[in-house]
Interface confidence: low
């Protein structure tokens, strides 16, 4: 069937359209195009005779039409009046006619739209604004965008006039946005420039900052006021109702108690004509004096004296606070506060009570601290320590002993040998000693302030022969795979080499064995039962050597998984069942039995005479080592056949 296709169907003014013919019959004489839906000679556009290939314009020919041999018609430079139907009349060779009609629509290319507004400065919660998209264009669709988004759903937004007009009722400050309109028709779409809606609002109730309402005499008062407003608000300050200045900030230096009162900020919007005020009450407090601490005893003696610290000056209706070592007071029966907290008493002072101590006076604004006070606690002397710790020396070396005792004031020292006073020094030095220098060396420490005196006595042996050493241990019963043991070879002797043997052999190489303290200490990490050996230490110098008696390490271990013997699991009825359980363990474990889960006796051997098939079941041996806290068990199945 003969058909006409319009390409495109919607044509923009000034463009071109092709009326494309489909299913053109064979054996044609010619064809003609007509404007309209029927063949009308008055409205013929063009005719075409195939034989002569001659095209003849008709009355409706505008000069913009071109006919093709395949009967298609091209119309150029389209105008609005070209809209409508076009009919093709085909004349076949047998003079039988055929007709087909096609159509297209012409639309203008849209101009860039613009937005007009009926109110350039609407007031919040009062005015409405109507935006209109210009120009008005026939057959155009109107769209609106807010901040480049499609219109939100809102009862305050209304479209009218074929969507050409957007009305915002009762505008708010949140309607301050970018508005655009768009026009569309089948051949074009154009968007307007943005229009920013400038909503007048405010002022809101102003906020005064900072929020602080209490000040101390002598400080500066600096208040700032802010109110949300468009255009920005104009500000005025009033103090106790009296106008001060028209600024956003109010600054009063070096305030006094007289500056206390009500401070009002007024915000004014000249466009909306609205005023809002906020009031804050400022209180200025007088500056209290800086506190200080007095003490009833400036040099208390440890464990004897008490000290009373008092916070000055005395002020009525004031809270007193105390700190020790920059911390609040610890709970201690030796610390007592008076009823008004003004006096802190330290009962039976110790050297740790030196402080520093601070007191504070609390007012409405802050706490004023005193300067810190440190107590000079007299103590000691403690028992003096004599160093070095060596007790054995070889003849010919120099003996240099030093004494120290904790004391305040520092102790005075005296040395005695075998009870005879030697010198009043902290150090004692004797060169090139001999066996005759062996004896009791006493250090005496004296505290002149407390009158106390303490002594320490050390036995010094000068001998070419080393003493027989001994081994001390930090753990006499270590647990396997858990504990470490440190053996130390005593005594500590000067210029001495320390040696170790295990079961008569030199130390094996093992990451679990470590020598330290000049080889004087042997540490066994993560002991095992194999470490239960005889350990011997030896000391030697250039002239002598000696060995300790052996110390055997008692390693607690187990219990290991027990073994039930005999291994038989099948018995004849009437036989005796005699099961023995054994588990490697130190100390020996406690044994118990269960038959089919039921507890039996606490023995290593389980004996049942003349067993029957009723004795079939599971026989479990449980072992427990109370020293290691570990348990173990094994289960054996017994079958008795009739």
């Amino acid at each position: 069937k003969l058909t006409i296709e319009s390409t495109p169907f919607n044509v923009a003014e000034g463009k071109e359209v092709l009326l494309l013919v489909h299913n053109l019959p064979q054996h044609l004489f010619g064809y003609s195009w007509y404007k309209g839906e029927r063949v009308d000679g008055n409205r013929q556009i063009i005719g075409y005779v195939i034989g002569t290939q001659q095209a003849t314009p008709g009355p409706a020919y505008s000069g913009r039409e071109i006919i093709y041999p395949n009967a298609s018609l091209l119309i150029q430079n389209i105008i609005q009046n070209d809209t409508g139907f076009y009919t093709l009349h085909v004349i076949k060779s047998d003079l039988v006619n055929e007709e087909a009609t096609g159509q297209f629509r012409v639309y203008p290319e849209l101009p860039k739209p613009s937005i007009s507004s009926n109110n350039s400065k609407p007031v919040e919660d009062k005015d409405a604004v109507a935006f209109t998209c210009e120009p008005e264009t026939q057959d155009a669709t109107y769209l609106w965008w807010v901040n480049n988004q499609s219109l939100p759903v809102s009862p305050r937004l209304q479209l009218s006039n074929g969507n050409r007009t957007l009305t915002l009722f009762n505008v708010t400050r949140n309607d301050t946005a970018s508005y655009k309109c768009e026009t569309q028709n089948p051949v074009s779409a154009r968007r307007s420039d943005s229009v920013i809606l400038n909503v007048l609002y405010g002022p809101d109730a102003p906020t005064i900052s900072p929020l602080n309402t209490s000040y101390r005499s002598g400080e500066n008062l600096n208040l700032s006021c802010h109110a949300a407003s468009n255009p920005p608000a104009q500000y005025s300050w009033f103090v106790n109702g009296t106008f001060q200045q028209s600024t956003q900030e109010l600054f009063i230096p070096n305030i006094t108690v007289n500056n206390s009162g009500s401070y009002t900020c007024q915000a004014h919007n000249s466009d909306t004509g609205l005023n809002r005020t906020t009031v804050t009450t400022i209180t200025v407090y007088a500056e209290p004096p800086k506190p200080f601490i007095t003490s009833n005893n400036s040099n208390p003696v440890e464990d004897e004296d008490a000290v009373a610290l008092t916070c000055e000056p005395e002020i009525q209706n004031t809270t007193y606070l105390w700190w020790v070592n920059n911390q609040s007071l610890p709970v201690s029966p030796r610390l007592q506060l008076s009823n008004d907290n003004r006096t802190l008493t330290l009962l039976s002072v110790t050297r740790n009570d030196v402080g520093p101590y601070e007191c504070g006076i609390q007012n409405e604004l802050s706490v004023d601290h005193s300067d810190p006070v440190i107590l000079n606690v007299l103590y000691g002397p403690d028992d003096p320590t004599i160093s070095p710790s060596y007790t054995y020396y070889r003849p010919g070396v120099n003996l240099s002993l030093s004494c120290h005792a904790a004391s305040n004031p520092p102790a005075q020292y005296s040395w005695l040998i075998d009870g005879n006073i030697q010198q009043h020094t902290q150090e004692l030095f004797i060169s090139n000693i001999t066996e005759k220098n062996s004896g009791l060396y006493t250090c005496q420490a004296n505290n002149s302030a407390s009158g106390h005196s303490r002594t320490t006595v050390k036995t010094i042996t000068v001998s070419a022969e080393l003493p027989k050493p001994s081994i001390s241990s930090n753990n006499s019963k270590p647990v396997e795979d858990k504990d470490a043991v440190a053996f130390t070879c005593e005594p500590e002797a000067q210029n001495t080499t320390y040696l170790w043997w295990v079961n008569g052999q030199s130390l094996p190489v093992s990451p679990r064995l470590q020598l330290s303290n000049g080889n004087r200490t042997l540490t066994l990490f993560n002991v095992t039962r194999n470490d239960a050996r005889a350990y011997v230490c030896g000391i030697q110098n250039s002239v002598s050597a000696n060995r300790s008696d052996p110390v055997t390490l008692d390693v607690l271990y187990g219990p290991d998984t027990p073994i039930i013997s005999p291994p038989d699991s099948s018995y004849l009825s009437g036989a005796n069942l005699n099961l023995s359980c054994h588990s490697a363990s130190n100390p020996s474990p406690q044994y118990s039995w269960r038959i089919n889960g039921i507890p039996q006796q606490h023995t290593q051997v389980l004996f049942i005479a003349k067993i029957t098939p009723n004795n079939n079941g599971t026989y479990a041996c449980f072992v427990s080592n109370l020293a290691t806290g570990r348990n173990n068990s094994i289960v054996k199945s017994i079958t008795v056949s009739a």
Partner: antibody
Framework: QVQLQESGPGLVRPSQTLSLTCTVS?????????WHWVRQPPGRGLEWIGY???????NYNPSLKSRVTMLVDTSKNQFSLRLSSVTAADTAVYYC?????????????WGQGTTVTVSS | DIQLTQSPSSLSASVGDRVTITCSTS?????MHWYQQKPGKAPKLLIY???NLASGVPSRFSGSGSGTDFTFTISSLQPEDIATYYC????????FGQGTKLEIK
């Protein structure tokens, strides 16, 4: 923090002795621990060589024991490795490492490694 | 000698994947340690004594196991985890696994 730094020649001739030193900073060797050498041939895994303790106690990998000597110098806070009669198979990156123990022994601090090539 | 066998010898995984490496021993050991080695760098301790996280190591790394079978896991693979991972035990003397090379898909 504890740091280990290996040093020594990068090229050793076959049959000669390889000598490397590890300098410890941020920790005193004589305070304890064991001090190890580990090597890694090109493109291969890690092989433990041995360790020395500050007291001079040593323990070597059985496969290298006959050729390895380790020494410690607590005054310089250093320990060293000597590997004699080297061949091309001894070409590797050599690391020194500190051993820590939490009842179990592992290497918690390593040097950045030094490359040793055995070639004529 | 106790032999350590790691599997797989290499693996490729995506960021965010859970990655598991196993280490089998020729006889029973009481613990296992794990190290990470990035190209050209020294090994770094990640896990000690089977399951303890070394200081400063992210919590996505973990370890478990006992006897002869031990496992090392990265719960959510990160790009910076590209490295070779070694298991390590110390019985008579220290030995290491042959290593597992981890790559990002």
């Amino acid at each position: 923090q504890v740091q280990l730094q290996e040093s020594g020649p990068g090229l050793v001739r076959p049959s000669q002795t390889l000598s490397l030193t590890c300098t410890v900073s941020g920790f005193t060797i004589s305070s304890g621990y064991s001090w190890h050498w580990v090597r890694q041939p090109p493109g291969r895994g890690l092989e433990w060589i041995g360790y020395i303790q500050y007291s001079g106690i040593t323990n070597y990998n059985p496969s290298l024991k006959s050729r390895v000597t380790m020494l410690v110098d607590t005054s310089k806070n250093q320990f060293s490795l000597r590997l004699s009669s080297v061949t091309a198979a001894d070409t590797a990156v050599y690391y020194c490492a500190r051993e820590d123990y939490d009842y179990h022994w592992y290497f918690d601090v390593w040097g950045q490694g030094t490359t040793v090539t055995v070639s004529s | 000698d106790i032999q350590l066998t790691q599997s797989p010898s290499s693996l490729s995984a995506s960021v965010g994947d859970r990655v598991t490496i196993t280490c089998s021993t020729s006889s029973s050991v009481s613990y296992m340690h794990w190290y990470q080695q990035k190209p050209g760098k020294a090994p770094k301790l990640l896990i000690y004594s089977t399951s303890n996280l070394a200081s400063g190591v992210p919590s996505r790394f973990s370890g478990s196991g006992s006897g002869t079978d031990f496992t090392f896991t990265i719960s959510s693979l990160q790009p910076e985890d590209i490295a070779t991972y070694y298991c390590h035990q110390w019985s008579s003397y220290p030995t290491f696994g042959q290593g597992t090379k981890l790559e990002i898909k």
